[in-house]
């Protein structure tokens, strides 16, 4: 972690393993204004690579729902709505940080916890790898 | 929140706020084993909507380091290297926690903080208006 | 459970053009692909083209200016039309659903076929 | 197109027997999202395939344990542990990593 001078406004800690454990207020600051993915945009249809929108759900999580994007086609959709086998459709993935509880049903303590989850689809060029 | 029962082998909150503020333990289980975005994969150059990936750090901020993508072009990458403005290269975004020091500087006390970033690019077809 | 069934003709005359019908039960025509697939007497298994959930379409390339698929997803049919019919396109014709929900992306339930002879 | 080619044509065996088929393709099987999609069917006399192996090694439901597959890249193997008189018919590997293709078959018959 970065090293950062102590503040004497700074609530105190008395855990013993200080920094791992820190104290997290849940009143989430939102910067943005964004919705449920799956209004927000329509990249997911009007994408070459479109893809559908699964929901993932874990009481044991913070946030407790996340969509999953899974593309719907290997290839990728040409002008004329026929999907095109030279090109591929791939899932962009992000790591994300969600809060699980631990110990598990605990309402005010966590764990950070990192997971991948792929957020939409792009069209990519294959590498193509012939037998010689 | 979720109402989940009280478990009696549960660290005990002494906030007045509670559930509002809760520990957190900041020793990451990663359930995934994905490096930086720029190794993971070169996606990012081999897609008909390519995009660049810009570091943006704040060190009141966990994780200090996010990569942001924007895309390259505003039309989408042709198999013949050009780029075709029939069709739109856009930003897959994202909301993501983050940890925001609060107050600034303190090393052990965190607001959970949504953010919006752009993840990759895709190709979509545009939406046309035409005059009437 | 998932059916697929195959309905055709039976016999079409050389240059005259098959529509075969496959009536789906037990699943949605917008969550999953059906493909069409031949198979000539005594030969091997010929895939002909996908019409996928969001309804585009994948062909097989060189049969792709003969071929035409289309679908109604109120009625729960597929069907699939075939020009310029010679002797060698004598063969069972099966549609079968593509497990597209659950991304294998293969066919995992197929009709029982349909023959198709082409002959005058 | 990506050509799949079988070996053998055909596979006589005794009952209780281990059988193995080969698969090769043309081209890697590699998608470029790291999947690899090869897929086996067996379709028995007067009958329509069915599908046995998705995504190289995964057992479609129902498919008996003694069913196995392997392999990667351009090369792949079905094996049978120990042949049962229902598993007679014709095997036919798939791929869809590129538009679909299918093996020529491999017709597993009693010795």
């Known amino acids: 972690g970065i090293a950062i001078p102590r503040n004497s406004g700074c609530p105190n800690s008395e855990d013993k393993n200080f920094p791992r454990t820190v104290m997290v207020n849940l009143n989430i600051h939102n910067r943005n204004t964004s919705t449920n993915p799956k209004r927000s945009s329509d990249y997911y249809n009007r994408s070459t690579s479109p893809w559908n929108l699964h929901r993932n759900e874990d009481p044991e999580r913070y946030p407790s729902v996340i969509w999953e994007a899974k593309c719907r086609h290997l290839g990728c959709v040409k002008a004329d709505g026929n999907v095109d086998y030279h090109m591929n459709s791939v899932p962009i993935q992000q790591e994300i940080l969600v809060l699980r509880r631990e110990p598990r049903h605990c309402p005010n303590s966590f764990r950070l916890e990192k997971i991948l989850v792929s957020v939409g689809c792009t069209c990519v060029t294959p590498i193509v790898h012939h037998v010689a | 929140g979720i109402a989940i029962p009280r478990n009696s082998g549960c660290p005990n909150s002494e906030d007045k706020n509670f559930p509002r503020t809760v520990m957190v333990n900041l020793n990451i289980h990663n359930r995934n084993t994905s490096t930086n975005p720029k190794r993971s994969s070169d996606y990012y150059n081999r897609s008909t909507s390519p995009w660049n990936l810009h570091r943006n750090e704040d060190p009141e901020r966990y994780p200090s380091v996010i990569w942001e993508a924007k895309c390259r072009h505003l039309g989408c990458v042709k198999a013949d290297g050009n780029v075709d403005y029939h069709m739109n290269s856009v930003p897959i975004q994202q909301e993501i926690l983050v940890l925001r020091r609060e107050p600034r500087h303190c090393p052990n006390s965190f607001r959970l903080e949504k953010i919006l970033v752009s993840v990759g690019c895709t190709c979509v077809t545009p939406i046309v208006h035409h005059v009437a | 459970q998932v059916q697929l069934k195959e309905s055709g003709p039976g016999l079409v005359a050389p240059s005259q053009s098959l529509s075969i019908t496959c009536t789906i039960s037990g699943f949605s025509l917008t969550s999953y692909g059906v493909h069409w697939v031949r198979q000539p007497p005594g030969k091997g298994l010929e895939w002909l083209v996908v019409?996928?959930?969001?309804?585009?379409?994948t062909y097989n390339s060189a049969l792709k200016s003969r071929l035409s698929i289309t679908r109604d997803n109120s009625k729960s049919q597929v069907f699939l039309k075939m020009n310029s019919l010679q002797t060698d396109d004598t063969a069972i014709y099966y549609c079968?659903?593509?497990?597209?929900?659950?991304?294998?992306?293969?066919?995992?339930?197929w009709g029982q076929g349909t023959p198709v002879t082409v002959s005058s | 197109d990506v050509v799949m080619t079988q070996t053998p044509l055909s596979l006589p065996v005794s009952l209780g027997d281990q059988a193995s088929i080969s698969c090769r393709s043309s081209?890697?099987?590699?998608?470029?999202?790291?999947?690899?999609?090869l897929h086996w069917y067996l379709q028995k006399p007067g009958q329509s395939p069915k599908l046995l192996i998705y995504?190289?090694?995964n057992r479609f439901s129902g498919v008996p344990d003694r069913f196995s597959g392997s392999g990667s890249g351009t090369d792949f193997t079905l094996k049978i542990s120990r042949v049962e008189a229902e598993d007679l018919g014709v095997y036919f590997c798939s791929q869809s990593t590129h538009v679909y293709t299918f093996g020529g078959g491999t017709k597993l018959e009693i010795k």
């Open positions: 995504k190289v090694s």
């Open positions: 081209q890697s099987l590699v998608h470029s999202n790291g999947n690899t999609y």
């Open positions: 079968a659903r593509d497990s597209t929900w659950d991304y294998y992306y293969t066919m995992d339930y």
């Open positions: 019409i996928w959930s969001d309804g585009t379409t």
